[in-house]
């Protein structure tokens, strides 16, 4: 079977500062030199793109400056960090990997990571 398998953790809890990190690992059926990684959010049956980056194997993963994602790559493993999350952003985050070059193209879609985000309690007013 020449399909590409993508693995990611089932559940991640965001930090109190709204930061969530997880590893997206793919089993490459070919020797790709150019890879595109996309983080998708699935809510009900709607899928939206959170962020995307294309990188050359051996080089760093670079998201756009205004992206809420950062990441590093090592071999067939990508360490993804999503920032600025709030409770309303709780949901299923899917890692999508595409082997763009050289041919053939391969698509790999993970089962998704359920990210739970809990907004921090506001600090109580204190008297000095």
């Amino acid at each position: 079977c020449k399909a590409m398998h993508v693995a990611q953790p089932a559940v991640v809890l965001a930090s109190s500062r709204g930061i969530a990190s997880f590893v997206c690992e793919y089993a490459s059926p070919g020797k790709a030199t150019e890879v595109r990684v996309t983080v998708l959010r699935q809510a009900d049956s709607q899928v939206t793109e959170v962020c995307a980056a294309t990188y050359m194997m051996g080089n760093e993963l670079t998201f756009l400056d205004d992206s809420i994602c950062t990441g590093t790559s090592s071999g067939n493993q990508v360490n993804l960090t999503i920032q600025g999350l709030r409770a309303m952003d709780t949901g299923l985050y899917i890692c999508k990997v595409e082997l763009m070059y050289p041919p053939p193209y391969y698509l790999g879609i993970g089962n998704g990571t359920q990210i739970y985000v809990i907004d921090p309690e506001p600090c109580p007013d204190s008297d000095f």
Epitope: A3, V47, L107
Partner: antibody, heavy 118, light 108 residues
């Protein structure tokens, strides 16, 4: 609403050229891979070509390789298919289709007919 | 190249009956990358099922998909008059993208 509209089809002689266009609206065009799929009269669907995101990566079906060129202009939200050295067997309805985030072709244009005949 | 073979070529059924369409792949296809499309005469194809079993937006629940490996099935539980059409399976996990030859569901 999300829409794809093809244009540029017509009747052309063998060996001549034709350029098809596909105007996209209602979505962020540059975030999607875009395909051309064709259907000869009374036949099934045949994938023709794909172009990804920024337009650098393209793939073609063997029967059209070296003759057809797929391109896109993200500033104009438009997909193109330049067809050269046309053959009788290229006669078909040509559809542009969007590759959805999960890979399947979720949005299709209405199609444009290309007839290659002397 | 992954070759998809659909059967039967034509299915003659009456409204209200159950339709079972088959799609067989020449090599194993991950179920994440198998889709079904419906096409009516003079119209563009319409996505019904993606990921072998997930219904696309707006598709009624009488349509369901199943299968894994090399064998996939599209089931229409109770045929409505508007369901008589040609159905295509497709794999989109690797290039080249390929379609089955189609199954025509016609009124008996």
């Amino acid at each position: 609403q999300v829409q794809l509209v093809e244009s540029g089809g017509g009747v052309v002689q063998p060996g001549r050229s034709l350029r098809l266009s596909c105007a996209a609206s209602g979505f962020t065009f540059s975030s999607y891979g875009m395909h051309w799929v064709r259907q000869a009269p009374g036949k099934g669907l045949e994938w023709v070509a794909v172009i990804w995101y920024d337009g650098r990566n393209k793939y073609y079906a063997d029967p059209v390789k070296g003759r057809f060129t797929i391109s896109r202009d993200n500033s104009k939200n438009t997909l193109y298919l330049q067809m050269n050295s046309l053959r009788d067997e290229d006669t078909a309805v040509y559809y542009c289709a969007r590759a959805g985030y999960l890979g399947a072709f979720d949005i299709w244009g209405q199609g444009t007919m290309v007839t290659v005949s002397s | 190249e992954i070759v998809l073979t659909q059967s039967p070529g034509t299915l003659s059924l009456s409204p209200g009956e159950r339709a079972t369409l088959s799609c067989r792949a020449s090599q194993s296809v991950s179920s994440s990358y198998l889709a079904w499309y419906q096409q009516k005469p003079g119209q563009a194809p319409r996505l019904l099922i993606y990921g072998a079993s997930s219904r696309a937006t707006g598709i009624p629940d009488r349509f369901s998909g199943s299968g894994s490996g090399t064998d996939f099935t599209l089931t229409i539980s109770r045929l409505e008059p508007e369901d008589f059409a040609v159905y295509y399976c497709q794999q989109y996990g690797s290039s080249p993208w390929t379609f089955g030859q189609g199954t025509k569901v016609e009124i008996k």
